[in-house]
């Protein structure tokens, strides 16, 4: 049912496809860079301008007309903490979810020219400036060097590295992915004259490999090969070395000194999985056992009479969980004072919610400074009077983000900085704070149009909207916009949300469509306030479909009860909670229950499959683009977490039972569309393969879909068309619409 | 269904007060705002405050502070409002109305109203 | 705070004619709510985030606006749409409504 009666009514237009795949409505962001306490750059026509915080007032910091000479594309820039010199990025080639690798150049800005003498080499992997002055570290080949001035020659750290097998100062593929989320491992100390790296040695870690088609005029693919490990295969292993930058010298080479993992650390397996400065001679790093419910902090000062660092064993922090792992994805950071003598972290309280508590770095226990049955999503600033976090408190709604301060003299004194600024249109938060917390500019990404506002914290005053994307409203007035509901249901006891995106027009007594569009992932969270325009707002607009998604069990943000329920039992209860979810909003009166769908990608095309094979007779289809189908191909860091070992010992048996591959029989029973990338990373083609192979043995007709050479985000601009375009058909058609 | 259920009219005399009680049902009362709104003889609709029955938070339009109090009781998913030290100035119908979270929001239930009369 | 007027105060249309109540915000809002209320009983959800139907609203009514200027629209007036209509803001606290405009049949 179109409701057709309602649209011919309403004589505006629709969002379509074709909005959605021609970005034709665009949403404005305002992207800002602080350079100090009280001033950022912001691009605007690529000049890039200076602006005062207090006044808004602003220069030119540099005119687009610059580099007009330069004869390269300009990527990105970087400029130096002391504002002498600007790193420009061109020739940028990237590589997984956050590596790449590109050419620099060094603008001098006092001299007005580019730094012609002993520049960066191409194909450099990463490159950073030092946290003030304009020293600057990179790494070339997995060797990391240090340049003391732009201009003077680099002093080579290391001398190891060696292509896919050691990484000195870049992690390898599982640590990028799952640990540290950046291809960075390299942390300066505070002022510069301490660089920390991390050294990975994958020489043990089998290769995943894949063809590559490239070119029409390639002859003969080539091969892919990375190293992989995959659950229960052979880990890299981790060595943690800090460098003195200010003892380099050009006759002697570097002497990096080794922190050893804890011996708690070093009787098995195990991760580096946080590092961060406390004070100039001081460093945290938190290590975890590849049984990831158990981790430990050491906390480590220079002793300059050896040039060594002393981990006392007294100073170590232990943090474990019985009911699951450490941590949402992995332990959280600490943010300490500025002594380095105390510090606050985030971690999971005795109610299962995780909270702010404070650490004295002597003592073994801490003080909880917030509680109740909400989380904290993280810690934004720390200064001498007050502690600012996002949390998910305010009216009970766990898919809300909040910006709070806290009193540290006194924590029953807690302000919410951003509830009432804006309650209508701004639910969803996230805080850029300047290098002093002096201001700071809130991102509300929802309900409404995103709105970008910049505050002073003396008096928490608003000074201005920077962009209230009032452009765009005035365009989307135009267009019939579907309506987004979030809401709850009750299942024994426990409250679960769920958001719906509703066709415009929406009327309860008419019969709807309805697609499920999951993720479902371990501490996922796709029930929220934010406002998107997507594939679901075409599917809502134009062809009048309900667009669903359910947190359900093993979600994120509501506390470990709920998160922790799916602990070593992947594709269990967070499938059953879809299909529970499918037949709950079936009984709400609106929705066609010949017609529901559900759709998902990554762990969403896994549970999907999973979904669609348990012969529920809920669902009438659905579409899994680059889904896990057995954990044992995907990556050890992600899939060990939340399932152990693939042994008889530890967790074998529900490693077999939770494969796709095993439901093969009751896809006969639905519509099903699988979808991959042939040079998917991260979710290996394999794993479709290996569904597909099991739907062709047991007879199942089904559709399937390959984009040669692309990754897990299928994002070139032809295969993002064409995906989105073949998947509406493929739902269109399962609907019966026209 | 959901619904708001209020209660019956009050005769009440000049610098009294009065407790008003709105009773929720067909819904998770904890997890919704109850909002009160004043509309006077012949006259248009004032927002008075909200109380958010999770935790009791409240907010109050300035100009009835001191006047209305709001309070719920989770026990019972029943929210009050106590209106002090009355005047012939705060005869109305008192409405109580639920604030659903559907995009940026709206109120979709409303209570059929009590009518408070201050006379002497 | 954000005074909302509404204009007109009161009218009359006849039925099938196209009926404009118009609703000005002091300052700038990001959403409209509108509400019926006819005599006696409490106000009724109508259209809400400025231009969606409640649910059992017809198709003929619409919303409209931005920024300070909204509008809810009649395309054809019906004996059943005489009642008063409340534009309502809560973009800004305190909430606010407008003084409401009575529409009549003719």
């Known amino acids: 049912n179109k409701g057709t009666d309602d649209a011919t009514a309403d004589s505006r237009k629709t969002y379509t496809l074709t909005d959605y795949l021609k970005n034709t409505y665009r949403l404005k962001l305002y992207s800002l860079r602080w350079i100090s306490d009280h001033e950022y750059l912001y691009k605007q026509e690529n000049n890039i301008l200076v602006f005062n915080a207090e006044y808004g007032n602003s220069s030119v910091f540099l005119e687009n007309s610059t580099f007009d000479e330069f004869g390269h594309s300009i990527n990105d820039y970087s400029i130096s903490p002391d504002g002498q010199f600007i790193l420009l990025e061109y020739n940028y080639v990237k590589q997984w979810r956050h590596s790449y690798t590109a050419s620099y150049d060094i603008y001098d800005l006092n001299k007005r020219q580019l730094i012609t003498e002993e520049r960066i080499p191409n194909n450099t992997q990463w490159v950073t400036w030092s946290p003030v002055g304009h020293k600057l570290a990179y790494v070339w080949n997995n060797d990391i060097y240090v340049k003391i001035e732009p201009n003077l020659p680099s002093y080579r750290i290391t001398w190891t590295g060696k292509e896919d097998i050691i990484y000195n100062g870049i992690t390898d593929w599982v640590y990028e992915e799952e640990v540290f989320s950046a291809y960075s491992a390299l942390w300066w100390s505070p002022n510069g004259t301490f660089l920390a790296y991390a050294q990975f040695n994958d020489t043990e870690v089998p290769l995943i490999e894949y063809s590559f088609y490239s070119d029409e005029s390639l002859q003969y693919p080539k091969t892919v090969r990375v190293p992989y490990p995959k659950a229960g295969a052979v880990n890299p292993t981790v060595k943690f070395f800090v460098v003195n930058t200010d003892s380099l010298s050009s006759v002697t080479n570097a002497t990096s000194i080794q922190i050893t993992a804890p011996a708690s650390m070093l009787i098995g397996d195990h991760y580096l999985c946080d590092v961060t400065w406390a004070t100039q001679e001081r460093i945290s790093l938190q290590w975890l056992r590849r049984i990831q419910n158990y981790s430990v902090m050491d906390i480590c000062d220079y002793d300059e009479s050896s040039g060594r660092w002393n981990c006392l064993v007294a100073r170590q922090h232990i943090e474990m969980s019985t009911t699951g792992w450490v941590g949402r994805f992995r332990p959280s950071e600490p943010h300490f004072t500025l002594d380095g003598n105390s510090f606050y972290k985030i971690i999971s309280n005795e109610e299962g919610y995780r909270h702010i508590c404070y650490f004295q770095i002597d003592k073994k226990d801490c003080t909880f400074i917030t509680k109740g049955t909400w989380e904290v999503i993280g810690i934004e600033a720390l200064t001498s009077d007050y502690l600012y976090y996002i949390s998910n408190e305010y009216k009970g709604m766990p898919g809300g983000r909040n910006l709070y301060k806290i009193q540290l003299s006194d924590y029953t004194k807690v302000t919410c900085l951003s509830c009432e600024l804006n309650p209508e249109r701004c639910q969803y938060y996230s805080v850029s704070f300047s290098k002093e917390a002096k201001y700071y500019q809130l991102r509300c990404s929802g309900p409404g149009l995103p709105l970008y506002t910049l505050h002073s914290s003396v008096n928490d005053k608003g000074l201005r909207v920077l962009e209230d994307n009032s452009a765009l409203d005035k365009m989307l007035q135009n267009v019939q916009m579907p309506s987004k509901k979030l809401d709850f249901i009750i299942l024994n006891e426990t409250k679960f949300w769920y958001q719906m995106i509703l066709p415009p027009h929406f009327d309860k007594s008419k019969k709807y469509p309805l697609l499920l569009d999951v993720y479902a992932g371990p501490c996922s969270q796709k029930a929220d306030t934010v406002f998107r325009l997507n594939w679901a707002t075409y599917l809502a607009s134009t062809e009048n479909i309900i667009v669903a998604s359910f947190d359900g069990r093993g979600s994120g943000y509501q506390g470990d009860k709920i998160m922790h329920a799916i602990n070593r039992r992947l594709g269990t209860f967070e499938v059953e909670d879809q299909i529970e979810a499918a037949r709950q909003f079936s009984k709400m009166g609106f929705v066609d229950n010949k017609r529901i769908a559900i759709w998902g990608w990554s762990y969403g095309g896994y549970v999907t499959s999973m979904v669609l094979g348990s012969g529920s007779g809920v669902f009438k289809c659905g579409i899994a683009v680059a889904p896990v189908s057995r954990w044992e191909y995907y990556d050890s860091v992600y899939t060990e977490r939340y399932m152990g070992l693939p042994t008889p010992e530890d967790n074998l048996d529900h490693y077999r039972n939770s494969t796709v591959m095993s439901r093969a029989e009751n896809f006969k029973q639905v519509e099903y569309l699988l979808i991959h990338g042939t040079a998917d990373d991260n979710v290996h083609f394999q794993q479709s393969a290996q569904i597909s192979k099991a739907l062709v043995d047991v007879g199942v007709d089904f559709q399937a879909m390959w984009y040669t050479d692309e990754d897990h985000g299928i994002a070139s601009s032809t295969a993002h068309q064409h995906i989105y375009t073949h998947m509406s058909h493929f739902i269109k058609q399962c609907f019966s619409l026209p | 269904e959901v619904q708001l259920q209020e209660s019956g009219a009050e005769l009440v005399k000049p610098g009294a007060s009065v407790k008003l009680s709105c009773k929720a049902s067909g819904y998770t009362f904890r997890s919704y705002d109850i909002n009160w709104v004043r509309q006077r003889p012949e006259q248009g609709l004032e927002w008075i405050g909200w109380i958010f029955p999770g935790d009791g938070s409240t907010k109050y339009n300035e100009k009835f502070k001191g006047k209305a109090t709001l309070t719920t009781d989770k026990s019972s998913s029943t929210a009050y409002m106590q209106l002090s030290r009355l005047t012939s100035e705060d005869s109305a119908v008192y409405f109580c109305a639920r604030w659903t979270v559907v995009g940026p929001g709206y109120f979709d239930v409303w209570g059929a109203g009590t009518t408070v009369t201050v006379s002497s | 705070q954000i005074v909302l007027t509404q204009s007109p105060a009161i009218m009359s249309a006849s039925p099938g004619e196209k009926v404009t109540i118009t609703c000005s915000a002091s300052?700038?809002?990001?959403?409209m709510n509108w509400f019926q209320q006819k005599p006696g009983t409490s106000p009724k959800l109508w259209i809400y985030?400025?231009?969606n139907l409640a649910s059992g609203v017809p198709a003929r009514f619409s919303g409209s606006g931005s920024g300070t200027s909204y509008s809810l629209t009649i395309s054809r007036m019906e004996a059943e749409d005489a009642a008063t209509y409340y534009c309502?803001?809560?973009?800004?606290?305190?909430?606010?409504f407008g003084g409401g405009t009575k529409l009549e049949i003719k």
């Open positions: 985030s400025t231009s």
């Open positions: 309502q803001q809560r973009s800004s606290y305190p909430n606010t």
């Open positions: 300052s700038s809002v990001s959403y």
